[in-house]
């Protein structure tokens, strides 16, 4: 049998746009674990030292958050016990865009897995009938 | 529930430094979701946000202020502080502090305030 | 920074009449926006956050609409309590920024 935590878990996420000077979403999941103190959920972004967003133990932690996302991130605190690990950013920047890494640690195992978030200014298209 | 209360001097002299304390009750400062702000409020008018901090001692200061301003924390305590140096009769003021969510960003509770005249 | 413009600066309604206030941004704030009312030597209370969603303990008669640059707090049937000073704040970008605040008095 395999001992708690060295397990590797299915992380998913989706690559993903955001709207400059809107409110964005980078979505991920994981295999939900009922145990939420137990659930660690670690945002990263390539080429950025300090963390993008860190929850754990049933709340957030922004100890180690890089200052570019000071006061801007959040997880959908009540959804992580069923999985979802996304991440809420408030004002998108252009500077947002690049490779973002969801890792998770649960009392099952632990895994990650890359996004990309494009970031511009796109629009609905215009449908003429 | 969550408690905050402002302490200091309520007068301070021209060109000297204004420091006030903040203690957080009913709950811990170390709270992972939250900043601790500073807002201030001139008699008769509206509200000026100072900057805020976390639990590890990050900060982050409205840069018309920044130059002279200085959010601390002691977490052994449950306080946090701002200092504001060579003040004028300009910073007389109400001086608020509150829990500020991390985001959202809103204030929420508020300290009951404390007024702060520059004088000499 | 952005700037937070609220109107009118006074509004004399009577009691059990609706109260409509508005708050302007001076570049989009999306839903970042937070409203607080202030009683003459008292803190402010917050009332609505993410532009429409009420704090916890907050009646019902106040909601909060809007997004982007254009926001408004209603006040459904003001009750006595309600006579106050009520401000906006955006919390979309630093520095926040709050509105000089609309005076609602009886009328």
């Known amino acids: 049998f395999g001992i708690s935590g060295k397990h590797f878990i299915t992380v998913t996420t989706f690559t993903s746009a955001g709207n400059i000077g809107e409110d964005g979403t980078l979505s991920c999941t994981f295999e939900p674990d009922i145990k939420l103190n137990g659930i660690v959920i670690q945002w990263l972004k390539e080429g950025i030292k300090g963390l993008v967003h860190e929850f754990k133990e049933g709340k957030d932690d922004l100890s180690q958050q890089h200052e570019m996302f000071r006061g801007r991130t959040a997880v959908f605190a009540d959804q992580v016990v069923v999985g979802n690990a996304s991440l809420r950013l408030k004002n998108v920047q252009l500077t947002d865009a690049g490779t973002y890494t969801c890792y998770i640690r649960t009392s099952k195992g632990k895994g990650n897995a890359n996004l990309e978030y494009k970031t511009g200014a796109f629009s609905m298209p215009e449908i003429n009938v | 529930q969550l408690q905050l209360q402002e302490s200091g001097p309520g007068l301070v002299k021209p060109s000297e430094t204004l420091s006030l304390t903040c203690t957080v009750s009913g709950g811990s400062i170390k709270s992972g979701s939250y900043y601790w702000g500073w807002i201030r409020q001139p008699p008769g008018k509206g509200l000026e946000w100072i900057g805020n901090?976390?639990?590890?001692?990050?900060?982050y200061y409205n840069p018309s202020l920044r130059s002279r301003v200085t959010i601390s924390v002691d977490t052994s305590k449950n306080q946090f502080s701002l200092k504001l140096s060579s003040v004028t009769a300009a910073d007389t003021a109400v001086y608020y502090c509150?829990?500020?969510?991390?985001?959202?960003?809103?204030?929420?509770?508020w300290g009951q305030g404390t007024l702060v005249t520059v004088s000499s | 920074e952005i700037v937070m413009t609220q109107s009118p600066a006074t509004l004399s309604v009577s009691p059990g009449e609706r109260a409509t206030l508005s708050c302007r941004a001076s570049?989009?704030?999306?839903?970042?926006l937070a409203w607080y009312q202030q009683k003459p030597g008292q803190a402010p209370r917050l009332l609505i956050y993410?532009?429409?969603t009420r704090a916890t303990g907050i009646p019902a008669r106040f909601s909060g609409s809007g997004s982007g640059t254009e926001f408004t707090l209603t006040i459904s049937s003001l009750q006595s309590e309600d006579f106050a000073v009520y401000y906006c704040?955006?919390?979309?970008?630093?520095?926040?920024?709050f509105g000089g605040g609309t005076k609602v008095e009886i009328k």
């Open positions: 570049q989009s704030v999306s839903s970042n």
């Open positions: 704040q955006q919390y979309h970008s630093f520095p926040f920024t």
């Open positions: 993410g532009a429409s």
């Open positions: 509150a829990r500020e969510g991390s985001y959202p960003n809103q204030f929420d509770p």
């Open positions: 901090i976390y639990y590890s001692g990050s900060t």
